[in-house]
């Protein structure tokens, strides 16, 4: 969001004021409340960064994120027998990603058409609400998953219905919290017509009174409460997990688990470094600069950081891969273009052939789909 200027009386991601209606006269539009942007912001809004780079990234996120998270949700809901807490958190993570990614075609079209939003006020608000909602949901569910992974290593007890119910309760609480904290994004007017550029922006230019104080306070609160605190919990969980894994006995099975745990840690760390840290940091810096100077010199960086934050929808499937045995099976087979059922039939027929040749016992892979802890 950048700062726009209202040119009537008073008044991002440019400062502006809630604009009035407009009516067409001749070849142009006569606006009743006008927003003006500075030259740097105008160059960003019309430049290759927002009209070429962003659509490319969002297209990649959509093409990768939609099927992978769709498959993950399907696996966790219908192909996983035991609904462990980890499965519940990952299912919610996949759902959050899907709810954000399904709106990406509109976002892609918006940027390709020179940051011109033609889909109306309500859709813009939904897109923005889901965009930020996804980021903060991902952070919180990732934190829950990380803490839960550590808890399993410390307390390797069997699956209990109580644990699953607690995980469902925590998930519902997270959804409710995110819904509450994103209310301002749904309430505030996000679309603004920029006469100089002849475009209607969605979230890229926001009203001045709102930006100056409220938006800085809003994103600072979110950065502390929904980013820094969960990040600290996640880091602590993984540090303790590494310590536990180091001191544990080393057999072939635990070595596999340890390697997978390390891969998971690296994936989550990458997600924080690429997606969550730059966006949360730049959200605060960007709005601080607008609050103090009336314009943001980090606007281009802020745009890139927010864009990269959507990559979490592509990185999350790797988390599912390292955590869920079921997702691993389905992902491998999906990539090899064959169904899990076909693989299992192959395994069963292979087993029976071996049985007929040798009279020794041979156990096939379990048909019960497991989730590795």
């Amino acid at each position: 969001t950048i700062q726009g200027t209202n040119r009537s009386s008073k008044g991002r991601s440019l400062i502006g004021k809630v604009d009035g209606t407009s009516h067409v006269t001749g070849k142009g539009v006569t606006v009743e409340t006008v927003f003006s942007v500075d030259e740097f912001s105008a160059s960003v809004l019309t430049g290759k960064l927002t009209t070429v780079f962003l659509p490319i990234v969002y297209t990649i996120v959509f093409v990768v994120g939609l099927p992978s998270n769709g498959m993950a949700l399907w696996v966790f809901l219908f192909r996983t027998k035991k609904k462990h807490p980890a499965v519940i958190y990952m299912a919610n993570l996949a759902l959050a990603d899907l709810l954000s990614v399904i709106w990406f075609p509109l976002k892609i079209a918006y940027h390709i058409h020179g940051n011109n939003w033609i889909y109306g006020e309500a859709l813009c608000n939904v897109l923005i609400g889901f965009f930020y909602g996804n980021m903060y949901c991902s952070i919180l569910f990732m934190t829950c998953l990380s803490v839960q992974r550590y808890w399993v290593i410390v307390n390797p007890m069997g699956h209990s219905r109580k644990k699953a119910n607690i995980a469902i309760g925590i998930s519902l609480a997270i959804w409710l919290l995110i819904l509450l904290v994103t209310i301002p994004l749904y309430v505030v007017k996000q679309t603004i017509f920029i006469p100089a550029l002849n475009i209607t922006t969605c979230h890229d230019v926001l009203p001045e009174q709102l930006l100056v104080g409220d938006m800085f306070n809003y994103f600072l609160s979110l950065a502390i409460g929904v980013f820094l605190f969960p990040a600290f919990l996640t880091a602590s969980a993984y540090v303790l997990m590494i310590r536990m894994l180091r001191s544990s006995a080393m057999d072939e099975n635990s070595e596999k688990k340890r390697k997978r745990a390390i891969k998971l840690i690296v994936t989550v760390l990458a997600m924080y470094l690429i997606c969550f840290t730059p966006s949360n940091l730049l959200l605060v810096v960007h709005y601080f600069l607008i609050k103090s100077q009336g314009q943001s010199h980090v606007y281009a960086l802020y745009i890139v950081a927010l864009c990269l934050s959507t990559l979490n929808s592509c990185i999350d499937p790797f988390v599912y891969y390292f955590v869920s045995h079921d997702f691993r099976d389905h992902a491998k087979n999906a990539l090899l273009c064959r169904s899990v059922r076909t693989v299992k039939q192959m395994q069963v027929s292979l087993t029976s052939k071996k049985h007929s040749r040798k009279s020794s016992s041979y156990s096939s892979s379990s048909t019960t789909v497991k989730t590795s802890y």
């Epitope: 008073k10 142009g28 539009v29 942007v37 006469p195 001045e208």
Partner: antibody, heavy 119, light 106 residues
């Protein structure tokens, strides 16, 4: 070099309209906006409205409904029409060039057009 | 609407003296303030834009400072041609001119 040349002085009757022209040279009207400012005798400057290079316009609340700003790219001329004239509209009307962005000033001005409204 | 208040209304000084003109905004306008000079029968002329940037061809004796709500135009040593009316203009939220300060020969 950049120049804005305005039309000559006008004497109008109350209730009538006046159309002041502003011919631009040394720059393209499609790349720059033109703003209009007026100054009543012995008074300060008062901002009236703007037309952007793409034809979009915005008028100060005080003049909304009475003022119309247009531009003709083929002749590089901007126009300001003020209707329902009253005696208090007697003023010198200036046009000025504006880049169209928040951080740009009104860098070049026309010489001004005196409009006298008298019965 | 943002109101700009210029002071003093009239400044009586002799050539060679330093002139300090003030412009106060009713709310924060950041750096978005310009200064214009107007001589009798002439159009306004841009001196300073965005608080402290000198326009093309403007002598170094003209300088601008301030931010937020308080702004100052300083003429370090008045030349005979500097006696005129000076207007400030804010362009952060709407375009509004100040009432003007007349710099006259004492």
């Amino acid at each position: 070099q950049v120049q804005l040349v305005q039309s000559g002085a006008e004497v109008k009757k109350p209730g009538s309209s006046v159309k002041v022209s502003c011919k631009a040279s040394g720059f393209s009207l499609s790349s720059y906006g033109v703003i209009w400012v007026r100054q009543a005798p012995g008074q300060g400057l008062e901002w009236m409205g703007v037309i952007w290079g793409n034809g979009n316009t915005y008028y100060a609340q005080k003049f909304q409904g009475r003022v119309t700003i247009t531009a003709d790219e083929s002749t590089s001329t901007a126009y300001m029409e003020l209707s329902s004239l009253r005696s208090e509209d007697t003023a010198v009307y200036y046009c000025a060039r504006w880049r169209g962005y928040k951080d740009y000033p009104f860098d070049y001005w026309g010489q001004g057009t005196l409009v006298t409204v008298s019965s | 609407e943002i109101v700009l208040t210029q002071s003093p209304a009239t400044l009586s000084l002799s050539p060679g003296e330093r002139a300090t003109l003030s412009c106060k905004a009713s709310q924060n306008i950041y750096k978005y303030l310009d200064w214009y000079q107007q001589k009798p029968g002439q159009a306004p002329r841009l001196l300073i834009y965005n608080t402290n940037s000198r326009a093309t061809g403007i002598p170094a004796r003209f300088s601008g400072s301030g931010s937020g709500r308080d702004f100052t135009l300083t003429i370090s040593s008045l030349e005979p041609e500097d006696f005129a009316v000076y207007y400030c203009l804010q362009h952060n939220s709407g375009w509004t001119f100040g009432g003007g300060t007349k710099v006259e020969i004492k």
